[in-house]
Structures are given as structure tokens and as C-alpha cells.
């Protein structure tokens, strides 16, 4: 089982790459493969729960071919996750001690083979389209988790899922501020890496409560938020689609990013 490796700051950097071509599957649409851990602890999903977790976040469980294509495009993650064929794998570009798996010191997608469905791991999900827009929301006092839910709903939107954030990231959403997502996690999308934004690679960063990269933020702690509005939703009064809306009150300051 691959280890967590050293905890850098208090965030986990998921390098996520767009899958644009898969050998033998030339018509696969562009999309994103991402590692997903919906709860506060590592390796907690059975195979069935893994499939459901991807669906809940607006994605589907990834296929081995999709993970392989992501690996070939530079994707690395030292966390074992379920795939669609009930195998458990993880992609390693730069082999290191806790992540060697079945490949010794060679790069490649590590595999544990087909595993019993009751064993628990993380999951790799795939999302290929975003039928709407993700926008970053904030205000002076920011939001508890419940307030974030209510804020998004009051602006004709819902709190974005992790899958929606990954899809928006793949289409250019870049924000160096972590925000609430629908599963209670705290994440932020980085297209252009910079020192103050958690690492030297593009990706969606996950913020954990503890230095060992476990724990979700408390729902009563205050943070920004990412909202999602479906394509059919009507813009709020004072808002122009794709632009920066007029602030509904003197306190709120929110930014809409068309993706």
C-alpha cells in the first residue's frame, strides 16, 4: 500500500491532466481523470461505494485506459484507487520508496489486480463535460458550510461538486483561494502554478485539517465557496452571463467565471 509521503504544508496537490487521446479509443472525448477521497480518511471506499462516490460528485469511475492515458500525460498519484473493472491501481511517474508497488523503481501505473469488492481504497473518477458554469463566491465574513449552500442557492446555483470543480479547472478556472464544495471538502483549482498557491504543478489542491493530510474542515469554520449553475438556469438580477455581476449587497463580493 503506498504511503502518504511527506506532508507538505497542509494541502494535498492532485496533479490532474486532461485525457485527450487513449490508445485504442481514438474517439474518447477530452476529460479529466482525478483521484477522489470523499471523506476525512484514506482508503474508506468499497467498490460499490467508489462507483457511487464518483456519480455523486458529477463524474463516473475511471477506466484503466483512462488512467493509463492520464499517466502517459504526466499524471501521478501515490494513492491506490478503484477503477471501473474492479482493479485497484495508481499512476507513478517518479518512483519513490512508499509508491513502488509492483513495478519496483520503474515508472508506470501500479496495479493490485482485481480486488474483492469489500476491500476499501480511494477511487479514480473521470469527468468529461461541464454543462454550466462554476463560480467563486466570497464575502467579508466568508461562509460556514451551511451558509455556502444557502448562498449558492440564493444565486440560482448549487454548491459545486468536486467533479464540477475539476471540469472547470480543465477549462481554465484558476483561483488561489480554497472554497467549500458539496461534499464538505475544501479545494482550489490552479492552472498557473505560483509559490503562494501550493506547489509547482497545475492541479486541484485539497486542503486537509491536519498536517498528516487527513480530516475535513469543520462545517462551522469559514471559507470561500465554489458554486455551480447549470446551463438552463436563469441569471440572477444584476448579473450578466459570464461577466462579473453587480454585488447584491454591500458585503458580498462574488466572481463569476464562465467555463
Amino acid at each position: 500500500t503506498p504511503g502518504l509521503g511527506p506532508a507538505t504544508a497542509f494541502t494535498s496537490e492532485d496533479l490532474v491532466v486532461q485525457v485527450t487521446a487513449v490508445p485504442g479509443q481514438p474517439h474518447l472525448p477530452g476529460g479529466v481523470v482525478f483521484h477522489y477521497r470523499p471523506g476525512p480518511t484514506r482508503y474508506s471506499l468499497t467498490f460499490e461505494e467508489a462507483q457511487q462516490a464518483c456519480l455523486r460528485t458529477g463524474a463516473v469511475i475511471a477506466s484503466p485506459e483512462q488512467l493509463q492515458a492520464a499517466y502517459e500525460a504526466g499524471y501521478e498519484q501515490c494513492d491506490a484507487g478503484w477503477l471501473r473493472d474492479q482493479t485497484v491501481r495508481y499512476p507513478i511517474v517518479s518512483p519513490r520508496t512508499p509508491c513502488v508497488g509492483d513495478k519496483d523503481s520503474s515508472p508506470g501505473v501500479r496495479t493490485y489486480g482485481v480486488r474483492p469488492s469489500t476491500e476499501t481504497y480511494d477511487v479514480y473518477c473521470f469527468v468529461d463535460r461541464l454543462e454550466g458554469e462554476v463560480f467563486f463566491a466570497t464575502r467579508l465574513e466568508q461562509f460556514t458550510f451551511q451558509e455556502a449552500l444557502e448562498f449558492c442557492e440564493s444565486h440560482n446555483a448549487t454548491l459545486a461538486t468536486t467533479g464540477q470543480l475539476y471540469a472547470a479547472w480543465s477549462r481554465g478556472l484558476d483561483k488561489c483561494y480554497a472554497g467549500w464544495l458539496a461534499d464538505g471538502s475544501l479545494r482550489y483549482p490552479i492552472v498557473t502554478p505560483r509559490p503562494a498557491c501550493g506547489g509547482d504543478k497545475p492541479g486541484v489542491r485539497t486542503v486537509y485539517l491536519y498536517p498528516n493530510q487527513t480530516g475535513l474542515p469543520d462545517p462551522l469554520s469559514r471559507h470561500h465557496a465554489f458554486c455551480f449553475r447549470g446551463i438552463s438556469a436563469v441569471p440572477s438580477p444584476g448579473e450578466e452571463e459570464g461577466g462579473t455581476p453587480t454585488s447584491p449587497s454591500g458585503v458580498e463580493e462574488w466572481i463569476v467565471t464562465q467555463v
Partner: nanobody, 115 residues
Framework: EVQLVESGGGLVQPGGSLRLSCAAS????????MYWYRQAPGKQRELVAS???????NYADSVKGRFTISRDNAKNTVYLQMNSLKPEDTAVYYC?????????WGQGTQVTVSS
């Protein structure tokens, strides 16, 4: 570097009071939300109280009416006044803040409520 240093813990009898302090690095304090968490032996760390930039406060149901969080921006310090203490308040109390997409913790201060 972000530093949070708690003090004020100790042994107190049931019904007694304690005031915890958390001194924060000056550069981060005045514009940050601040939190007090606690962790009892064998239990998960839980959020006890929070205070926003404007001084708005929130409390866990278990401490409402007994604990008060406050801040002194001039002293870069956040306080937790704990009254009517109960044995179940025994825990290590931690100061916490969130800065540049990271959570930061103090080292904790032990509070023991026992007769």
C-alpha cells in the same frame, strides 16, 4: 512563519472557571478568523468556538452559555473564557486559524476538570 501559542490551562474543580489565551503572529492576526478546538482522550478534535473578523461568535452546543470567545486585535490575542466547567470539558484545547489555504495549530493547553 505562522505561530500560535496557547496558555492558561490547568486543573480546576467542577463549577470553576479558566481563561485560555492564544497569542498569534502579528502579521496574521488582525484579518483572520480564529478558532478554539478541543480534543478529549480517545475522541475526535471538535470545534468549540469561533470568532470572525467583525467579532461575531459561534459556539458548539455543549458550551453555549458557559464559554465566551473574544479577541484583542491590539494584542494579537484570542481568548476563551470558560465558566461553570464540567468534568466532560477535560481536554487539550487548541487555537487554530486558516491562512493561505492552510490550517495552523498551536501546541495545545491541557484543561482538567476534576474534584
Amino acid at each position: 512563519e505562522v505561530q500560535l501559542v496557547e496558555s492558561g490551562g490547568g486543573l480546576v474543580q467542577p463549577g470553576g472557571s479558566l481563561r485560555l489565551s492564544c497569542a498569534a503572529s502579528g502579521s496574521i492576526f488582525s484579518n483572520r478568523f480564529m478558532y478554539w478546538y478541543r480534543q478529549a482522550p480517545g475522541k475526535q478534535r471538535e470545534l468549540v468556538a469561533s470568532i470572525t473578523l467583525s467579532g461575531s461568535t459561534n459556539y458548539a452546543d455543549s458550551v453555549k452559555g458557559r464559554f465566551t470567545i473574544s479577541r484583542d486585535n491590539a494584542k494579537n490575542t484570542v481568548y476563551l473564557q470558560m465558566n461553570s466547567l464540567k468534568p466532560e470539558d477535560t481536554a487539550v484545547y487548541y487555537c487554530n486559524t486558516f491562512l493561505q489555504n492552510s490550517f495552523y495549530w498551536g501546541q495545545g493547553t491541557q484543561v482538567t476538570v476534576s474534584s
